[in-house]
Interface confidence: low
């Protein structure tokens, strides 16, 4: 199995640790972890194109989208590779992350290793917001915390 890990950090209180595991190169990727310091409710959760955090989370670029598609939800045919889903923070500001995704990969063309994982300020409308921004970012707002996805032992 291939494993990866990402430590999420931002300017504010949001931080987290996210693990990735892929048993077979064409198989699904299991994503699990925890994020704390969030406001209660939904927060967009995406892989962005660049592993560049030199200017904070903004330098990570747009959603990872090697197929040049519109933004969508994780189960949509029309989605960015980096479109995971919303994570839900409870009243303590902690979000449980438990995802299995068959579009991202830890190898090949859809490899997310070396790219940036971002948790956003607001809920991702999953491309259903009815405006142009919805088809790009899901109107998920600012980038609260991010981290480069790296190979784990």
């Amino acid at each position: 199995a291939t494993k990866a890990v990402c430590v999420l950090k931002g300017d504010g209180p949001v931080q987290g640790i996210i693990n990735f595991e892929q048993k077979e190169s064409n198989g699904p990727v299991k994503v699990w972890g925890s994020i704390k310091g969030l406001t209660e409710g939904l927060h967009g959760f995406h892989v962005h194109e660049f592993g560049d955090n030199t200017a904070g989370c903004t330098s990570a670029g747009p959603h990872f989208n090697p197929l040049s598609r519109k933004h969508g939800g994780p189960k949509d045919e029309e989605r960015h590779v980096g479109d995971l889903r919303n994570v839900t923070a409870d009243k303590d500001g902690v979000a449980d992350v438990s995802i299995e995704d068959s579009v991202i990969s830890l190898s090949g063309d859809h490899c997310i290793i070396g790219r940036t994982l971002v948790v956003h300020e607001k809920a991702d409308d999953l491309g259903k917001g009815g405006n142009e921004e919805s088809t790009k970012t899901g109107n998920a707002g600012s980038r609260l915390a991010c981290g480069v996805i790296g190979i784990a032992q």
């Epitope: 704390k36 449980d96 438990s98 299995e100």
Partner: antibody, heavy 117, light 107 residues
Framework: QVQLVQSGAEVKTPGASVKVSCKAS????????ISWVRQAPGQGLEWMGW????????NYAQKFQGRVTMTTDTSTSTAYMELRSLRSDDTAMYYC??????????WGQGTLVTVSS | DIQMTQSPSSVSASVGDRVTITCRAS??????LAWYQHKPGKAPKLLIY???SLQSGVPSRFSGSGSGTDFTLTISSLQPEDFATYYC?????????FGQGTKVEIK
């Protein structure tokens, strides 16, 4: 407030199966996983596995692989844990707990399963 | 599987004492550690998550520290309701595993 309410105590014979239920309320059921933990008499806590309510992904401890099945019913916000081929050393208090990242923040009251011939 | 070793296995203390419980992981678990309090006939209660974050509603006399392989739970001033068994639990990799428990008893 968040609550997990488990089914009542069970007495089973060796070789039988038991199915424990765990009804959740006070939060969005699909946003968190459910873990199952047991404690045998005089022993410590033992993690059995968990299920992601969002997509039914399960991860079982090797010790229980092939003998345990964890399921959920989102229409009733209920999680289930079935343990088959029961042995006397499966006698324990079984707990469900809400999985939140790397911890379990709310727990059911426990279900005592006694395996005896 | 990752082994979690707690010490001591039991401790006798008086009300007002400072109590420290340690937990050692058999390999690096980053900050993936939680602490629970368990009283007979009751469900376990989460005290600390991600090694050092205090669960809401838990008194501030409880604190957690550590990273990597060595972790500590401290009760700064033991109260009568704190006599219980305490468990650490790692979540760095599956299966999640618990320490064997530390029983805090009245001296």
């Amino acid at each position: 407030q968040v609550q997990l309410v488990q089914s009542g105590a069970e007495v089973k014979t060796p070789g039988a199966s038991v199915k424990v239920s765990c009804k959740a309320s006070g939060y969005t059921f699909t946003s968190f996983g459910i873990s199952w933990v047991r404690q045998a008499p005089g022993q410590g806590l033992e993690w059995m596995g968990w299920i992601s309510v969002y997509n039914d992904y399960t991860n079982y401890a090797q010790k229980f692989q092939g003998r345990v099945t964890m399921t959920t019913d989102t229409s009733t916000s209920t999680a289930y844990m079935e343990l088959r081929s029961l042995r006397s050393d499966d006698t324990a208090m079984y707990y469900c707990a809400r999985k939140r990242g790397g911890d379990m923040d709310y727990w059911g009251q426990g279900t005592l399963v006694t395996v005896s011939s | 599987d990752i082994q979690m070793t707690q010490s001591p296995s039991s401790v006798s203390a008086s009300v007002g004492d400072r109590v420290t419980i340690t937990c050692r992981a058999s390999q690096d678990i980053s900050s993936w550690l939680a602490w629970y309090q368990h009283k007979p006939g009751k469900a376990p209660k989460l005290l600390i998550y991600l090694a050092s974050s205090l669960q809401s509603g838990v008194p501030s006399r409880f604190s957690g520290s550590g990273s990597g392989t060595d972790f500590t739970l401290t009760i700064s001033s033991l109260q009568p309701e704190d006599f219980a068994t305490y468990y650490c639990q790692q979540a760095n990799s599956f299966p999640w595993t618990f320490g064997q428990g530390t029983k805090v008893e009245i001296k």
